[in-house]
């Protein structure tokens, strides 16, 4: 599909944190189409030259990868289809913190969005009963 | 076209330093990094680290490090790598080369000869 | 540090041979392998990105694998193709280099 002409689509994220050593989600959903390999999935990160993951034609494209996130990163395959572009970063580390930009391709139109990323040794608030 | 121009050709005596140019033009200076390699004389290819021309970070060879420093001027998209403390075995062409994960283009190197 | 063991370290071939080089990773790197060509007194030359991807260079020129063990082949090698070429791994820093193979003329 030609890139020209086409509209804009919305995507939307949401700002989140990481614990650092466990693995983290960077959210991130867009307007749906129905067709899988029409779909471009960029995450990109600001200051970082490489991709931090793209996803395109129905699977995963690494060669331009980042190498500060090799075999760390996943989207939800499966989930694509329905508008999902979330990014899931695994063994998160504090050098990860910053700011992501999702960014989408699909037959409707292209679109993106930043989002903040925070990373910290965070602990669940104990809650008394 | 993509081209990075070198430095000329430089001969200095052990334990001075060099300082080797790299001038990139055609391309988004800040959108790929700079790395730097060596050969000496009859050799193989040695990695000796990378400069992020955005932000100015540097990740150097373990052995390099401490003796080599990489800097860049983003207003005239030029890259630099001083290597200090030189000994004979520094004697080598010197490349620095663009990319991500695969260099392209190269400069045309720079000869350091290091020499009492 | 990762490892690249290539060879051989040089060979005699013809114009018109297959010529098959390899390159054996100390660790898995994926499909994150570059191959460069070098002539005497030029800078080495991108010929393969990504294990398999061309550059450009022309058809005769493959590259495979996977994981730990890679191979670039030239289906003819044609005169120009005289020269010293070098697998490289672009999984982490330090991006090393293989210690490069020669092609000579038989």
């Known amino acids: 599909f030609g890139i020209s002409g086409r509209h804009s689509i919305t995507v939307t994220t949401v700002a989140s944190a990481g614990n650092i050593g466990e693995d983290g989600i960077l959210s991130c959903t867009f307007e749906p189409d129905i067709k899988l390999s029409d779909i471009v999935i960029q995450w990109l990160k600001e200051g970082v030259l490489g991709l931090v993951h793209e996803f395109k034609e129905g699977k995963d494209e690494l060669s331009e990868q980042d190498e500060m996130f090799r075999g760390r990163t996943a989207v939800f395959a499966d989930q694509v289809i329905v508008g999902n572009a979330s990014l899931r970063l695994k063994n998160v580390q504090l050098t990860d913190a910053g700011t992501y930009k999702c960014y989408i391709i699909t037959s409707k139109g292209k679109g993106n969005a930043n989002l903040e990323y925070k990373t910290g040794a965070f602990s669940m608030p104990e809650v008394n009963v | 076209q993509v081209q990075l121009v070198q430095s000329g050709a430089e001969v200095k005596k052990p334990g001075a330093s060099v300082k080797v140019s790299c001038k990139a033009s055609g391309y988004t200076f800040t959108a790929q990094y700079m790395y730097w390699v060596r050969q000496a004389p009859g050799q193989g290819l040695e990695w000796m680290g990378r400069?992020?021309?955005?932000?100015?970070?540097?990740v150097y060879a373990q052995k390099l490090q401490g003796r080599v420093t990489m800097t860049r001027d983003t207003s005239t998209s030029t890259v630099y790598m001083e290597l200090s403390s030189l000994r004979s075995e520094d004697t080598a062409v010197y490349y620095c080369?663009?990319?991500?994960?695969?260099?392209?283009?190269w400069g045309q190197g720079t000869l350091v000869t290091v020499s009492s | 540090d990762i490892q690249m063991t290539q060879s051989p370290s040089s060979l005699s071939a013809s114009v018109g041979d297959r010529v098959t080089i390899t390159c054996r990773a100390s660790?898995?790197?994926?499909?994150?392998v570059n191959w460069y060509q070098q002539k005497p007194g030029k800078a080495p030359k991108l010929l393969i990105y990504?294990?398999s991807r061309l550059h450009t260079v022309p058809s005769r020129f493959s590259g495979s694998g996977s994981g730990t063990d890679f191979t670039l082949t030239i289906s003819s090698l044609q005169p120009e193709d005289f020269a010293t070429y070098y697998c490289?791994?672009?999984?982490?820093?330090?991006?090393?280099f293989g210690g490069g193979t020669k092609v000579e003329i038989k």
């Open positions: 490289q791994q672009s999984y982490t820093s330090p991006f090393t």
């Open positions: 660790q898995n790197i994926d499909t994150y």
């Open positions: 990504a294990a």
């Open positions: 400069i992020n021309p955005t932000s100015g970070n540097t």
């Open positions: 080369a663009r990319g991500i994960n695969w260099f392209d283009p």
